[in-house]
């Protein structure tokens, strides 16, 4: 699987999950989140050659098409597969609130 | 929706489904399929700016991150959303067989 275990410990050039830290205030303009100040969101990057973690029959067909037509702009793309939530703390007036933000952290990628 | 109805009738520059015809023999090297000789597979292409048909909370965050960090390589990617099957005919000896190939035709796209 193109997950953090594999990708963070390798020098994989093809589609893999990469490290990305997002600072809520600086990178998103979200000043109201109290904790955490930011988080390891990660992102997906890298080419999707034929048979590299292809998502659907279509992805396989497109990767094969790409192999036969190397100059074509039609190619599978490296995108998130498994996403995890992030708990945050913010204040409503003086009262702290804990919220689970769904689908915030990329754990693995796929070629789609 | 970034579907064939919208995308094929517009000059949309952002993520949209584009026309692509795949010839089984020439483009994939699949000589064994009797009918059809090829099909309109389509493909997804175009940038994914902030708020453009974003798939998950993560896609929204990444698009917003990209807005604040325009030079970053982390950005959502335009990929298939709705896929449809394709019926094909091939021969096993002299006997024709009809098969549904699942997820072969792109009907719409999303930013993931």
């Amino acid at each position: 699987a193109l997950d953090t275990n594999y990708c963070f410990s390798s020098t994989e050039k093809n589609c893999c999950v990469r490290q990305l830290y997002i600072d809520f205030r600086k990178d998103l303009g979200w000043k109201w989140i109290h904790e955490p100040k930011g988080y390891h969101a990660n992102f997906c990057l890298g080419p999707c050659p034929y048979i590299w973690s292809l998502d659907t029959q279509y992805s396989k067909v497109l990767a094969l098409y790409n192999q036969h037509n190397p100059g074509a702009s039609a190619a599978p793309c490296c995108v998130p597969q498994a996403l995890e939530p992030l708990p945050i703390v913010y204040y409503v007036g003086r009262k702290p609130k804990v919220e689970q933000l769904s689908n915030m952290i990329v754990r693995s990628c796929k070629c789609s | 929706a970034l579907d064939t109805n919208y995308c094929f009738s517009s000059t949309e520059k952002n993520c949209c489904v584009r026309q692509l015809y795949i010839d089984f023999r020439k483009d994939l090297g699949w000589k064994w399929i009797h009918e059809p000789k090829g099909y309109h597979a389509n493909f997804c292409l175009g940038p994914c700016p902030y708020i453009w048909s974003l798939d998950t909370q993560y896609s929204k965050v990444l698009a917003l991150y990209n807005q604040h960090n325009p030079g970053a390589s982390a950005a959502p990617c335009c990929v298939p959303q709705a896929l449809e099957p394709l019926p094909i005919v091939y021969y096993v000896g002299r006997k024709p067989k009809v098969e549904q190939l699942s997820n072969m035709i792109v009907r719409s796209c999303k930013c993931s």
């Epitope: 000043k31 409503v92 007036g93 919220e99 | -």
Partner: antibody, heavy 121, light 107 residues
Amino acid sequence: EVQLVQSGAEVKKPGASVKVSCKTSGYTFITYWMNWVRQAPGAGLDWMGQIFPAWGMTNYNEMFEGRVTLTADTSTSTAYMELSSLRAGDIAVYYCARGYGNYALDAMDYWGQGTLVTVSS
Amino acid sequence: DIVMTQTPPSLSVSPRETASISCRASESVDSYGNSFMHWYLQKPGQSPQLLIYLASNLESGVSDRFSGSGSGTDFTLRISRVEANDTGVYYCQQNDEDPLSFGQGTK
């Protein structure tokens, strides 16, 4: 230029529901909280609640007894306020107002033009 | 809930004079070194507009004739060299405690 454009005036029967829209432009919709405030004829301002559009996270004023539902459509940068079980006391101008951005509860720096809701049998 | 009380309920001021409006909160609205108190003006037939943020910070685009002061429970909005265009209802608002609340207004 930041703009908040609300839907037109509504006339509803007692017991019915009303849904007011607030179409935004000129800023990043998922960066700010959106508040809803109402003003009865000749009266002051009452805060109804707020939504963070990226997740649909909401905070409501208990005064509205669970009758108010706030939603947001990030694809069109539009916020919505639905008020159910309408009664005569709900006759008011309803405003959407963007939070200043530093806190969840905050000052409001941009306001819609207001939507008059009339309840009449 | 924090109750905001404005005085006076209405005020008539001659042009070029100074006007003062008071707002008292039923409990302190100070937290983390800030006073969570803001001031708005609602001109006739218009939506409210933000004048002062966090007790004393002038909102951008607002005339410097407006100034805010105070902390804890007692706050004041001053309008110097009053103009006819300043006519309307002035509201204070706190966001230190949920629910956010407004004063009843000063006309």
